[in-house]
């Protein structure tokens, strides 16, 4: 039985040209995390495998950095980066948990003058 829950940063916004950290946290389970996949829509951004470490998709190497922790840092943001991001936790013995984050990338002036979500 899957008892765990994924906590995410939820809906976030960031300035065009800036960076953002995508974070998920799995709680309420003793299951072992074997791998975390990060996806944007259906595209793989990165994998963090418990045994093998990080794999950053070659398509995103120029704009993605691993961490902190099991999170992922997106850099040099563009308006096209707006959309859904998913953290997919592969665990044993529970199975797969998925968290969703919605990122809105705003033009600099918009972000400065009243972004809907604050970036820590």
């Amino acid at each position: 039985m899957m008892t765990g829950t994924i906590e995410t940063t939820g809906n976030i916004s960031a300035e065009k040209g800036g960076s953002i950290i995508l974070q998920c946290h799995l709680s309420s389970t003793t299951a072992q995390v074997t791998q975390v996949n990060w996806e944007q829509q259906d595209q793989l951004l990165a994998i963090c495998n418990a045994d093998l470490g990080w794999h950053i998709s070659p398509s995103f190497k120029d704009r993605v950095a691993p961490g902190p922790g099991l999170g992922l840092t997106l850099q040099s943001l563009t308006v096209n980066d707006t959309g859904e991001y998913f953290c997919i936790y592969h665990t044993y013995p529970d199975g797969t948990y998925t968290g969703r984050i919605f990122l809105e990338v705003l033009e600099s002036s918009v972000a400065e003058h009243g972004a809907r979500f604050q970036i820590p």
């Epitope: 996949n37 495998n49 070659p58 398509s59």
Partner: antibody, heavy 117, light 113 residues
């Protein structure tokens, strides 16, 4: 020990398709990418694409897009590469290779595909 | 696509002498996050698949003799065989795995002088 064992040589006519298999053993199949690389007679190495057996991810060289399909069967730890609309220039040795983040460390023995009318 | 340019095309070296093969990339292969260059070197003998020698530009693969070494960062790389042995006669390829599509150099044929 890590092994990638490929299917045997194939002779095909132009316009046909070929499906080459690569059976993995000696490691956790779903953890590593499998890449396909080909080598025409007397020529260098050409990357065709990759597939991640642990998920639905694959990436193809634009040169082969629309003609190549990579699939996997986790129950048998086997990856397949199918190339369609074959032409004489596709005559080559086709290799599968294992990859994570630090290059292709184990290679299959190669499968010779000959396209001839 | 990233173009990998190898030089020389062929090289003849005497037993026990040093062999040097160069590889130049059309784009930077250094990933800022881990400060590693995504460049590998392979050895291929006739009728055999390529064999990984060096990855991340300078890390020797397990079981590879220490006479093989890799150096360089960013766009310029070198494979050095410090003291050539008869079994080193082969074709050597560099490969970038920084970005899709992965690309190889045209190869350097190493022969005995």
């Amino acid at each position: 020990q890590v092994q990638l064992v490929q299917s045997g040589a194939e002779v095909k006519k132009p316009g046909a398709s070929v499906k080459v298999s690569c059976k993995a053993s000696g490691y956790t199949f779903t953890n590593y990418w499998i890449h396909w690389v080909r080598q025409a007679p007397g020529q260098g190495l050409e990357w065709m694409g990759d597939i991640y057996p642990g998920g639905r991810y694959s990436n193809y060289n634009e040169k082969f897009r629309g003609r190549v399909t990579m699939t996997r069967d986790t129950s048998t730890s086997t990856v397949y590469m199918e190339l369609s609309s074959l032409r004489s220039e596709d005559t080559a040795v086709y290799y599968c290779a294992r990859y994570y983040e630090s290059a292709m460390d184990f290679w299959g023995q190669g499968t010779t595909v000959t396209v001839s009318s | 696509d990233i173009v990998m340019t190898q030089s020389p095309d062929s090289l003849a070296v005497s037993l026990g002498e040093r062999a040097t093969i160069n590889c130049k990339s059309s784009q930077n292969l250094l990933y800022n996050s881990n400060q590693k260059s995504y460049l590998a070197w392979y050895q291929q003998k006739p009728g055999q698949p390529p064999k990984l020698l060096i990855y991340w530009a300078s890390t020797r693969e397990s079981g590879v003799p220490d006479r093989f070494s890799g150096s360089g960062s960013g766009t310029d790389f070198t494979l050095t065989i410090s003291s050539l042995q008869a079994e080193d006669v082969a074709v050597y390829y560099c490969q970038q795995y920084y970005n899709y599509p992965f690309t190889f150099g045209a190869g350097t044929k190493l022969e005995l002088k």
